[in-house]
Amino acid sequence: VPRWRQQWSGPGTTKRFPETVLARCVKYTEIHPEMRHVDCQSVWDAFKGAFISKHPCNITEEDYQPLMKLGTQTVPCNKILLWSRIKDLAHQFTQVQRDMFTLEDTLLGYLADDLTWCGEFNTSKINYQSCPDWRKDCSNNPVSVFWKTVSRRFAEAACDVVHVMLNGSRSKIFDKNSTFGSVEVHNLQPEKVQTLEAWVIHGGREDSRDLCQDPTIKELESIISKRNIQFSCKNIYRPDKFLQCVKNPEDSSCTSEI
């Protein structure tokens, strides 16, 4: 008799999830000499241990501590780039500006980027059919808790000037409910972080508005200033030119406003 399986509202675990995590780990540790000591089988075992046989609505940050310990990594604390709703451009930027890092440029972020996973209570099976949706089912699901945990740690590690890339095409350029707005902003340490610099990325070619005047940006400014961190805001009117100028800063067209 087939066993009854909980039907969740979100997509199931990404196919070939264990193989993908293991392969990503091997690739990452080969490319990054400072992480060559990492045993990828142990990393997978710790990852698996965080959610296998556990109710997928009852995951805690503590479940991920063994994985966090194995994935401990030092990135230059003054070279951190946060992002919200504009992941692709943020990643394109750090691929060019190699001394800056998004969360997904770290081992743990790289392992989990764009993946979904969950298990089932009291069985060692991975659920490939469905996983809990953050809104419709529960917030303490394996994926959400993972990103909350690594995002908090990443923000806590930041120092000096922290940059954040925000999507100027969204109705809420700064969204209090995003990972950046709900986790990272509140875990920047005023004793270490002097300034948060927001880069508001424009979508339209002819969009010359000053999006730093947007009410949601002023809300971010208020939150940050109350935490005794300076706030800076810059419009990136031409993201294509912005990337080009990161690649070729000597280009004569790169002295004007981007």
Partner: antibody
Framework: EVQLKQSGPGLMQPSQSLSITCTVS????????IHWLRQSPGKGLEWLGV???????DYNAAFMSRLSITKDNSKSQVFFKMNSLQGDDTAIYYC?????????????WGQGTTLTVSS | DIQMTQSSSSFSVSLGDRVTITCKAS??????LVWYQQKPGNAPGLLIS???SLETGVPSRFSGSGSGKDYTLTITSLQTEDVATYYC?????????FGGGTKLEIK
């Protein structure tokens, strides 16, 4: 080019009110905060208060009861008013621009308004 | 309020000297420190922020260091145009406060 130009009186009597206007160019008051400071031989440099780009203000508690900072974004002007002047308010008064949007230190300063309080 | 103390109010120096100016806060200011240079008749000008970051156009003979409560401004080889008064300012907490200044004078 960023500039801050101050206008205001030079000599005032005790108990009078000091009013200084700081007119800025080269940037918008909706993008940066404007701070007010003063410098005297006796007390050195003192931070008095700030009006942030959104219009909210923070004042040095020692001056809060007699200080008011307002602005008119459309005219690029910031207005400083200090009541109940006494002899020890004799100083050079400066407006200054915050280095970043919400900056706690200053990259451009006005030329200064020299105030002497004397009867 | 946080008190900022610059121990020497004036220094007699020679051109080419290495000059060190110190600034001590009454409590930890977590690297929220800037240095200004002021010449007679002028407003102060921003020199260094965040303890070590030189402002655009500031010569590389200027450098800043320190942490916690203790901070230092160093001029490696004093030039004529460096003769001025130097102030530190903390921006960890309001009211933002300044040191009393250190005036450099030529011997």
């Amino acid at each position: 080019e960023v500039q801050l130009k101050q206008s205001g009186p030079g000599l005032m009597q005790p108990s009078q009110s000091l009013s200084i206007t700081c007119t800025v160019s080269g940037f918008s008051l909706t993008s940066y905060g404007i701070h007010w400071l003063r410098q005297s031989p006796g007390k050195g440099l003192e931070w008095l208060g700030v009006i942030w780009r959104g219009g909210s203000t923070d004042y040095n508690a020692a001056f809060m009861s007699r200080l008011s900072i307002t602005k008119d974004n459309s005219k690029s002007q910031v207005f400083f008013k200090m009541n109940s002047l006494q002899g020890d308010d004799t100083a050079i008064y400066y407006c200054a621009k915050g280095k970043v949007t919400t900056g706690f230190y200053f990259d451009f300063w006005g030329q200064g308004t020299t105030l002497t309080v004397s009867s | 309020d946080i008190q900022m103390t610059q121990s020497s109010s004036s220094f007699s120096v020679s051109l080419g000297d290495r000059v060190t100016i110190t600034c001590k806060a009454s409590e930890d200011i977590y690297n929220r420190l800037v240095w200004y240079q002021q010449k007679p008749g002028n407003a102060p000008g921003l020199l260094i922020s965040g303890v070590t970051s030189l402002e655009t156009g500031v010569p590389s003979r200027f450098s800043g260091s320190g942490s916690g409560k203790d901070y230092t401004l160093t001029i490696t080889s004093l030039q004529t145009e460096d003769v001025a008064t130097y102030y530190c300012q903390q921006y960890w907490s309001t009211p933002y406060t300044f040191g009393g200044g250190t005036k450099l004078e030529i011997k």
